[in-house]
Interface confidence: low
């Protein structure tokens, strides 16, 4: 008889899930010699203490914890970028700019990119058939909640000049629903962070109004400037071009306005 | 360092089944898949399927799909093969192998390593 | 399923010769695959995974080469106990498959 199982409304569990996490431990400890330290059999306990058998609406940033501890990462704390709706174009663009930071590229980021999880209370399964969704079921699930904390914890390890990169092609550049806009916005430290700087990427080729006045990258600019942080925008035109200066500084034609 | 340890050779008459054991020691059990493959006398290897004991997924080859049921202990880190409705073809060496992944630079791999040291299964009436 | 096909199927060679063993596989398996040793009564050795990475505590003579559908086992140097049985296997796709095997005797 199979037995009954709670049916969420989001896809389950990423296919392969241990495998891929660990791998993705191993091939990360091993191309970032800092990180070599770390024992990936560990890490993987811990995430996956982290959340089987518990209940998938009842989780907690405690739950994290011991996997928090275990993948801290000291990345210079000026060199991050922070993302909101536009990942592709973020990770490219840190690839090419080896010194500069997504979550993505810190291990535990690097880990869940993309991967969804969730198990199921007082049982030791890994539930691949559903997971909460944070809408229709609830934001406390085990995905939700890792996302949160690794990122309030990317957001108070900036300083100085911290960079955001922000889709202008979305009706909402800056969504105060996001997880840059309800999470790190609000734990940006005042105290070490000077500027946040708004990169916004622009969609179309011919789009050349100046999306820096738009009524939501105001609203970031009220929410940051109240934390006594300074904000700076800047219109990225042309994305394609941007990388391509970023890869060829000293082309002649990345000396203009990108 | 991890060991493979199979259970011993076994005579079994066509039409019965047989249920071979690999039991893990040294290591990590449940994360990694155990593989069976199995080797007729003077012939190749022959990879029969897998189980990923920390989430009870199993993958069979084709040829042996409704004949062979794998399955593993977590408690006492031992994975088993049962093949059935035996014929004299079956005769052969049955290995358990475990995968695991290693690393380079660029990629990862995965890995047969280590193998048990056989179990000899012969079928005969 | 994916069909590795090896040749030769035996290869004749004098201690401190070069032997050069191929594998062949019906669809491309980009670079996962391993070539395993076996020696009679003994289960299979890896020896390559990633088409050219050697396992732990393989000796130096033993590299592998190529990616796709075409690779290559080579043996630089001949010694007494490289005479054994060898065999590809590719996992990239399920059902991992391994090819029929290469004897190395010797000549």
């Known amino acids: 008889v199979p037995r009954w199982r709670q049916q969420w409304s989001g896809p389950g569990t990423t296919k392969r899930f241990p495998e891929t996490v660990l791998a993705r431990c191993v091939k990360y400890t091993e191309i970032h010699p800092e990180m070599r330290h770390v024992d990936c059999q560990s890490v993987w306990d811990a995430f996956k203490g982290a959340f089987i058998s518990k209940h998938p609406c009842n989780i907690t940033e405690e739950d994290y914890q011991p996997l928090m501890k275990l993948g801290t990462q000291t990345v210079p704390c000026n060199k991050i970028l922070l993302w909101s709706r536009i990942k592709d174009l973020a990770h490219q663009f840190t690839q090419v700019q080896r010194d500069m930071f997504t979550l993505e590229d810190t291990l535990l980021g690097y880990l869940a990119d993309d991967l969804t999880w969730c198990g199921e209370f007082n049982t030791s399964k890994i539930n691949y058939q559903s997971c909460p969704d944070w809408r229709k079921d609830c934001s406390n699930n085990p995905v939700s909640v890792f996302w949160k904390t690794v990122s309030r914890r990317f957001a108070e390890a900036a300083c100085d000049v911290v960079h955001v990169m922000l889709n202008g092609s979305r009706s909402k550049i800056f969504d105060k629903n996001s997880t840059f806009g309800s999470v790190e916005v609000h734990n940006l430290q005042p105290e070490k962070v000077q500027t946040l700087e708004a990169w916004v990427i622009h969609g179309g080729r011919e789009d050349s109004r100046d999306l820096c006045q738009d009524p939501t990258i105001k609203e970031l600019e009220s929410i940051i400037s109240k934390r006594n942080i300074q904000f700076s925008c800047k219109n990225i035109y042309r994305p394609d071009k941007f990388l391509q200066c970023v890869k060829n500084p000293e082309d002649s034609s990345c000396t203009s306005e990108i | 360092q991890v060991q493979l340890v199979q259970s011993g050779a076994e005579v079994k008459k066509p039409g019965s089944s047989v249920k071979v054991s690999c039991k893990a020691s040294?290591?990590?059990?449940?994360?990694?898949?155990i593989n069976w493959v199995r080797q007729a006398p003077g012939q190749g290897l022959e990879w029969m399927g897998e189980?990923?004991?920390?989430?009870?997924?199993?993958h069979y080859a084709q040829k042996f799909q409704g004949r062979v049921t794998i399955t593993a202990d977590e408690s006492t880190s031992t994975a088993y093969m049962e093949l059935s409705s035996l014929r004299s073809e079956d005769t052969a060496v049955y290995y358990c192998?475990?995968?695991?992944?290693?690393?380079?630079?660029?990629?990862?791999?995965?890995?047969?390593?280590?193998w048990g040291q056989g179990t000899l299964v012969t079928v005969s009436s | 399923e994916i069909v590795m096909t090896q040749s030769p199927a035996t290869l004749s060679v004098s201690p401190g010769e070069r032997a050069t063993l191929s594998c062949r596989a019906s669809?491309?398996?980009?670079?996962?695959l391993a070539w395993y040793q076996q020696k009679p009564g003994q289960a299979p050795r890896l020896l390559i995974y990633g088409a050219s990475t050697r396992a732990t505590g393989i000796p130096a003579r033993f590299s592998g080469s190529g990616s796709g559908t075409e690779f290559t086992l080579t043996i630089s140097s001949l010694q007494s106990e490289d005479f054994a049985v060898y065999y590809c296997?590719?996992?990239?796709?399920?059902?991992?498959?391994f090819g029929q095997g290469t004897k190395v005797e010797i000549k």
């Open positions: 296997q590719q996992y990239n796709n399920w059902p991992w498959t």
């Open positions: 669809q491309s398996v980009s670079s996962n």
């Open positions: 189980i990923i004991p920390d989430y009870g997924v199993t």
């Open positions: 040294g290591g990590q059990f449940s994360f990694y898949a």
């Open positions: 192998a475990r995968w695991s992944y290693t690393y380079g630079i660029r990629y990862y791999y995965k890995l047969f390593d280590p």
